[in-house]
């Protein structure tokens, strides 16, 4: 594949990553492999910059994340390690919280009104942001 | 309820071309990527390609690049394919389908490529 | 492109067993997964995404299971209504693909 160089048509760059804002909601899996699609993958939040600029482009609607506890343990999907890693989870969350008797817990994470993080079930349907990274080889062949 | 509602059987002739539709109803249109799918007789399912209504965006199976043009009007809520150049191994039925996964499908359009 | 093996190509069956449909992929597409049944003269239908999510409307005897390059689809005790093709699909990456597909038939 070819290096990607600039951010693709209605993304946003910012700080060498490509940014997309969803206006639907879906599930946690349909907006995982929405991205994934897209050559991307939800939005690893890093830094407390990269925070504040995608809390400033969502404002205050829930939105999925690519943060997720699903086999265990909590994992972002680009691979970033989550204990080392930036954190700004709501006081007391992630809890894990059965009681919205939709049955199991709350596996998947999200940005709140405020920014903050939450875990809630993965079958609601959040807006969410894809991120790519400028200069990674993309997937899509060199146009000839 | 959503419902996708393509339109009728087509016989036409060698080397002519064909545009079929796919009106929808019942959910956001551009919210889902529509897919057009190809099963020959007593076949299996071949994915041709999907246009992303909020922007047009297309993508092809390789195979069917230069075969079939997807594309899509908004206002209708309908997607098209245009098949051209059509020989018999174009005879077939052409679903239309919803998102990456195929939640919903259309009935079928009944290709048949005849001289 | 990632190619979707199915096996058996046939399976005969008498209504009431449990029967087990595989989906092997080319290469991993972790739980990007989906089940179809296609009846006679009519549209697929989704039975069961992302590996083993179940879809409403579908009744609780179909299951899937698997993640990486082996899949599984289920039907945990089979009924006369189930006869007919199961295709599996990816959605790892483009382009999108089946399986050549498994027939379920009475034995």
């Known amino acids: 594949g070819s290096e990607r160089t600039c951010c693709p048509v209605n993304w946003v760059e910012h700080e060498r990553s490509c940014y997309w804002f969803s206006r639907s909601g879906k599930a946690w899996a349909d907006a995982d492999n929405y991205c994934r699609l897209e050559d991307a993958h939800l939005v690893v939040v890093t830094s407390w910059e990269e925070q504040k600029f995608v809390q400033h482009h969502i404002g205050p609607v829930n939105t999925w994340m690519g943060l997720h506890d699903q086999n265990g343990p909590w994992k972002w999907v680009d691979g970033t390690d989550y204990e080392t890693g930036f954190k700004n989870w709501r006081p007391e969350q992630p809890d894990d919280w059965y009681g919205h008797g939709l049955g199991g817990g709350e596996d998947c994470a999200h940005f709140t009104d405020d920014g903050r993080w939450n875990d809630d079930v993965c079958q609601r349907p959040y807006r969410w942001v894809c991120e790519t990274e400028l200069d990674k080889a993309s997937q899509e062949p060199p146009l000839l | 309820e959503v419902q996708l509602q393509q339109s009728g059987p087509e016989v036409v002739k060698p080397g002519a071309s064909v545009k079929m539709s796919c009106k929808t109803s019942g959910f956001t249109f551009t919210d889902y990527y529509m897919n057009w799918v190809k099963q020959g007789h007593g076949k299996s399912l071949e994915w041709i390609g999907r246009?992303?209504?909020?922007?047009?965006?297309?993508r092809y199976n390789q195979k069917f690049k230069g075969k079939a043009t997807l594309t899509v009007d908004k206002s209708l809520s309908t997607a098209y394919m245009q098949l051209n150049s059509l020989t018999s191994e174009d005879s077939a039925v052409y679903y239309c389908t919803r998102w990456f996964y195929f939640d919903y499908w259309g009935q079928g359009t009944t290709l048949t490529v005849s001289s | 492109d990632i190619v979707l093996t199915q096996s058996p190509a046939t399976l005969s069956v008498t209504p009431g067993d449990r029967v087990s449909l595989s989906c092997r992929a080319s290469?991993?597409?972790?739980?990007?997964l989906h089940w179809y049944q296609q009846k006679s003269h009519e549209s697929p239908r989704l039975l069961i995404k992302?590996?083993?999510q179940s879809i409403s409307g579908i009744p609780s005897r179909f299951s899937g299971s698997g993640s990486g390059t082996d899949f599984t689809l289920t039907i945990n005790s089979v009924e006369t209504e189930d006869f007919g093709m199961y295709f599996c699909q990816q959605s790892n990456s483009w382009p999108l693909t089946f399986g050549a597909g498994t027939k379920l038939e009475l034995k």
């Open positions: 246009v992303n209504p909020s922007n047009d965006d297309t």
């Open positions: 290469q991993s597409i972790s739980n990007y």
């Open positions: 992302f590996a083993s």
